[in-house]
Interface confidence: low
């Protein structure tokens, strides 16, 4: 079972805590570790047996406004001869992240946290074969 | 949501940048989607570059549980089910945003934090360096 929301009994912990209106929370979007870099192996998206392309989605009312999504290039996987082997499957690997969504309502704006599913890359898997009786 | 008055020029003027600090609604849109990769698919076992999932738990973060992938082999699994060292299993990494309590003891004050997670593994042709 889930407790949805505790009545709006918002409790302040130390005196130094910022006052926050009921039903909301204060979010600093200056990102901790903003400058860390992904040190992935070089162009694995092209060298993979399940290669993928990247598409950048851009939304000015989302923070961050750029989200990169991967798409598998093939249904099958690339074999040692560089040909597509359809006895194997290229499948997307996905990961959730948080974004902040800005919503305009007339002359007011509100902010909402949102979970977004990002396709990160692809991997080659043995297919699940369903036998029909 | 929590409404905040727009700038005085509304509706003509539009602030393109996000403010440094915002008040956000406590409800997270899509917050109940499945976050356990073991339950959502068995790709980690069926992949030619299989991986194990390790639980990274931090109660002062949201989400408090993040699953980290670690490739099981240096090579990839071939058609015979053996490890082929002519190919490499490599992690696919992704930067994600999480919430961190800041200041640490305040119940409703947070900061976004970028963390690097290994989401899964993929099988790649190795880069061969020829020594002159």
């Amino acid at each position: 079972r889930k407790i949805p929301k505790v009545g709006h009994t918002f409790f302040q912990k130390p005196e130094s805590c910022p006052p926050v209106p009921g039903g909301s929370m204060k979010l600093d979007i200056g990102i901790i570790n903003e400058n860390q870099r992904v040190s992935m192996s070089r162009n694995i998206e092209s060298r993979s047996t399940s290669p993928w392309n990247y598409t950048v989605t851009w939304d000015p009312n989302r923070y961050p406004s750029e989200v990169v999504q991967a798409q598998c290039r093939n249904l099958g996987c690339i074999n040692a001869q560089g040909k597509e082997d359809i006895s194997m499957n290229s499948v997307p690997i996905q990961q959730e992240t948080l974004v902040v969504r800005r919503k305009h309502q007339g002359c007011s704006v509100s902010f909402q946290l949102e979970k977004v599913l990002v396709t990160v890359g692809c991997t080659c898997v043995t297919p699940v074969i369903h036998h029909v009786q | 949501g929590i409404t905040i008055p727009r700038n005085p020029g509304c509706p003509n003027s539009e602030d393109k940048n996000f403010p440094r600090t915002v008040m956000v609604n406590l409800n997270i849109h899509n917050r109940n989607t499945n976050t356990n990769p073991k339950r959502s698919s068995d790709y980690y076992n069926r992949s030619t570059s299989p991986w194990n999932l390790h639980r990274n738990e931090d109660p002062e973060r949201y989400p408090s549980v993040i699953w980290e992938a670690k490739c099981r082999h240096l090579g990839c699994i071939n058609a015979d089910g053996n490890v082929d060292y002519h190919m490499n299993s490599v992690p696919i990494q992704q930067e994600i945003l999480v919430l961190r309590r800041e200041p640490p003891h305040c119940p409703n004050s947070f900061r976004l934090e970028k963390i690097l997670v290994s989401v899964g593994c993929t099988c790649v042709t190795p880069i061969v360096h020829h020594v002159a």
Epitope: K2, V6 | R61, P107
Partner: nanobody, 119 residues
């Protein structure tokens, strides 16, 4: 699977005492702040108390300060609420809750134990 089982509720006279217990299993108990939350008849949920992972810090809603004490035993995976000087307005179902850090969203909670304060 995460489980939280409360016990110790009952009927008590005003000014009396009760000790609630919560047995936790299925997660790393010592890694989480734990909470007591209550729901009075016909009312919404009210946060009562929180205790940090190592038990070093406790927080209380104003109406119970000085009367209630939250404690925990990490070796036993147990959470407690010692309730003294009980008043009629403390009558409620008391829940123990394990929470994500997002305030007021508890991802797991028990079935509750009823505390009735009446003469």
């Amino acid at each position: 699977e995460v489980q939280l089982v409360e016990s110790g509720g009952g009927l008590v006279q005003p000014g009396g005492s009760l000790r609630l217990s919560c047995a936790a299993s299925g997660f790393t108990f010592s890694s989480y702040s734990m909470y007591w939350v209550r729901q009075a008849p016909g009312k919404g949920l009210e946060w009562v108390a929180e205790i940090k992972q190592d038990g070093s810090e406790q927080y209380y809603v104003d109406s119970v300060k000085g009367r209630f004490t939250i404690s925990r035993d990490n070796a036993k995976n147990s959470l407690y609420l010692q309730m003294n000087g009980l008043r009629a307005e403390d009558t409620a179902v008391y829940y123990c809750a394990k929470g994500e850090i997002l305030p007021l969203y508890f991802d797991y909670w028990g079935q509750g134990t009823l505390v009735t304060v009446s003469s």
